[in-house]
Structure formats: structure tokens, C-alpha cells
Amino acid sequence: QKSSIEKCSVDIQQSRNKTTERPGLLNCPIYWQQLREKCLLFSHTVNPWNNSLADCSTKESSLLLIRDKDELIHTQNLIRDKAILFWIGLNFSLSEKNWKWINGSFLNSNDLEIRGDAKENSCISISQTSVYSEYCSTEIRWICQKELTPVRNKVYPDS
């Protein structure tokens, strides 16, 4: 089969570029999945943890933060492939010798049952069924999140 070499037409404004959005998000943007009061975006390539963290920021989002076991289960239910691992926003802080979320808070030991060691250069990944400690240099997929702004009913003073 003889193929001609063609040039590709590609989007001028790539979706990886930062976009300006109004503060406060009422609905999930296109391509994002809503999970309760969050919007999630699953990557289609692989990266070490640091690169994943940086790539989420280009989408004006962060690596996934998981509040509790319930949210973990709901997130895992969105994962369709059994053997695939995803980085989330949790890594081991050597100075504090504890698991630390990227928002600065520490892991409540009851929230996630982590398989693997808590040690230097360890980051947390999740699969369809489990939570793992992996070397942060491991190249796997990742999940970004944006918080939805809750819509509150406006209260008007009596006139």
C-alpha cells in the first residue's frame, strides 16, 4: 500500500492551553464528568505524578482530592478499565512523615486503605478496586478535578 504524505490540519487553539473562565462553576465543562459537586477529567496519556499535577493546572484544575471512603467508591465506579492506575493529589511528605494532600491537609488514616509503603518519593494512585502507594516517577494516567460552585437560593429582604 503506497500512501501519500499529507499535512494535518489541527486546532489553532489547542485545548491544552489555559482558558479564562468566570469564577465559580455551575456546570461541568464539555468533556468533564460530574460526580456530585465535582467535575472530573480522566487523562488519556501517562505521566509521572509531578507532570500530572502540572498538567491539571493547565486545565485550571487540580489532581483529584478525595474527602472520604464514600467519595473514593463513587470515583472508582467511574473507572471502566480494571488494571489501570490513576494518580490523585496525595503524596508522602518526608518532613512530616505523613500522607499529605496537595491542598496542604493530611490524610485521615481511616479514609483510604493504602496498599504499599509510606516512604519518600511515594505518591498515591487509585484503580477500580484499590488504592496504591507507587513511586512518584511511575508513569500512569491521572484524574483532574474542578469544584462546582453550589447554587444557593438568594434571600431578598422584605421591601
Epitope: V10, Y31, H44, T45, N47, N51, D81
Partner: antibody, heavy 120, light 107 residues
């Protein structure tokens, strides 16, 4: 202008290996994940795996996991796909294809294809 | 593995007529569906992503629709350059799979 140019046709014997190259131009090579897709004669398309040219990280279709190796040389903006222990049913056109977005699985640019014939 | 089934295998259409191509997924894939066009001796060319979003430079006569398991590519008025093979692909799972293709030929 974005372009992917692949190496020429190959004829191999069963059991041998083949290495196909894909040279990218017109964009930042390390900014987009490269995938490999093959098409057997008169058949549909089959996804083989991907490589992140920035880091060298790979993910392979389980079907090819034991036989395929994807690498890259960032200094010459080139991705490679090597398939070992070739069989007659590996006869196909092999395409490199650029992932258009880190968060969606579509291919917005394809190489012209490399025909690999496996015959004794 | 998600199986993508395209029908018909061959579609004979006259220039200027409408062509409707079908793609069915064996499981729900949401809207994570792509359509490509392939001409003889050429690589596939991206037409539509996310079931209905036309790629840059793709004429408005190409439109995609559907969600879940049933998807359609419509070419509203076939031009001579549209006679080709069309493939659908899903990326709802990380094992990307393609349909077997629909050949659109001149009637």
C-alpha cells in the same frame, strides 16, 4: 504545518523483528502523545499502544504487550515502534498517530503508513 | 473489549444525495466516539470527535450524532471527494477500538 513522516516498507521473515520510525515536524514533539495503530490488508484499524515523548512513558494494548516496544528520540523528534517475533498475521500497514489532547482519545494527525510484510 | 459494529458494510450513493452511516457499541460509551475518513492509499483523517464535534477544516456537510451505544455519521450532500471508507472509534475505555468500516461508493 503539522506532519508525521514514516520510514519505508519492510519485508521480514517470521520470527524476526521490525522497527518503524515516525518523524514529527511542525509542532512541539514532546507536547503530544504518540500512538501506533495498524491495519491488516482489507481489515479495520487496531490500536497498539502509546508513548509520551516528553517522558518516554508507555502504555501498550495487552495483545501486543510482550512483543512491542515504543521508544523515542527527542533530539530528532522521532518516535519508534518495534515489533518482535513477527508472524504472518502481523502483515499490515503500521501508522503513527498523534493524540490530539491529553484528555481525549482521538488522533488528529497520522503518518502516511509503513507497510510491513511478513513472509517466509 | 468494546466491539464497534458499523453498518452497512457498503453504501452506494449518488453524488448530491444524503448518506447515513451507523455505528453501534457493544457497551455504553457515552459520547466518546470519533469518526475518520480513509481514502485508498492514504491514512485516516479525523472528521468528528465526541460524537458530534467537527474537527478543524471539516465541511459542515459532515455531522455526527448519538450517545450511549448508537451513533450516526451523516453526509448531507455527497461530493465526489467524499467517496471513501469511514471508521468509528471509541475511547470510553483505554483499549481504543474501531469499527470495521463503511465503504461509501458511487452508485
Amino acid at each position: 504545518q503539522v506532519q508525521l513522516v514514516q520510514s519505508g516498507a519492510e519485508v521480514k521473515k517470521p520470527g524476526a523483528s521490525v522497527k518503524v520510525s515516525c518523524k514529527a515536524s511542525g509542532y512541539s514533539f514532546t507536547g503530544y502523545t504518540m500512538n501506533w495503530v495498524r491495519q491488516a490488508p482489507g481489515q479495520g484499524l487496531e490500536w497498539m499502544g502509546l508513548i509520551n515523548p516528553n517522558t518516554g512513558g508507555t502504555y501498550y494494548n495487552q495483545k501486543f504487550k510482550d512483543r512491542v516496544t515504543m521508544t523515542r528520540d527527542t533530539s530528532i523528534s522521532t518516535a519508534y515502534m518495534e515489533l518482535s517475533r513477527l508472524r504472518s498475521d502481523d502483515t499490515a500497514v503500521y501508522y503513527c498517530a498523534r493524540l490530539g489532547d491529553n484528555y481525549r482519545g482521538y488522533f488528529d494527525c497520522w503518518g502516511q503508513g509503513t507497510t510491513v510484510t511478513v513472509s517466509s | 473489549e468494546i466491539v464497534m459494529t458499523q453498518s452497512p458494510a457498503t453504501l452506494s450513493v449518488s453524488p448530491g444525495e444524503r448518506a447515513t452511516l451507523s455505528c453501534k457499541a457493544s457497551q455504553d460509551v457515552g459520547t466518546a466516539v470519533v469518526w475518520y475518513q480513509q481514502k485508498p492509499g492514504q491514512a485516516p483523517r479525523l472528521l468528528i470527535d465526541w460524537a458530534s464535534i467537527r474537527h478543524t477544516g471539516i465541511p459542515a456537510r459532515f455531522s455526527g450524532s448519538g450517545s450511549g451505544t448508537e451513533f450516526t455519521l451523516t453526509i448531507s450532500s455527497l461530493q465526489s471527494e467524499d467517496f471513501a471508507v469511514y471508521y468509528c472509534q471509541q475511547y470510553s475505555t483505554y483499549l481504543y477500538t474501531f469499527g470495521g468500516g463503511t465503504k461509501v461508493e458511487i452508485k
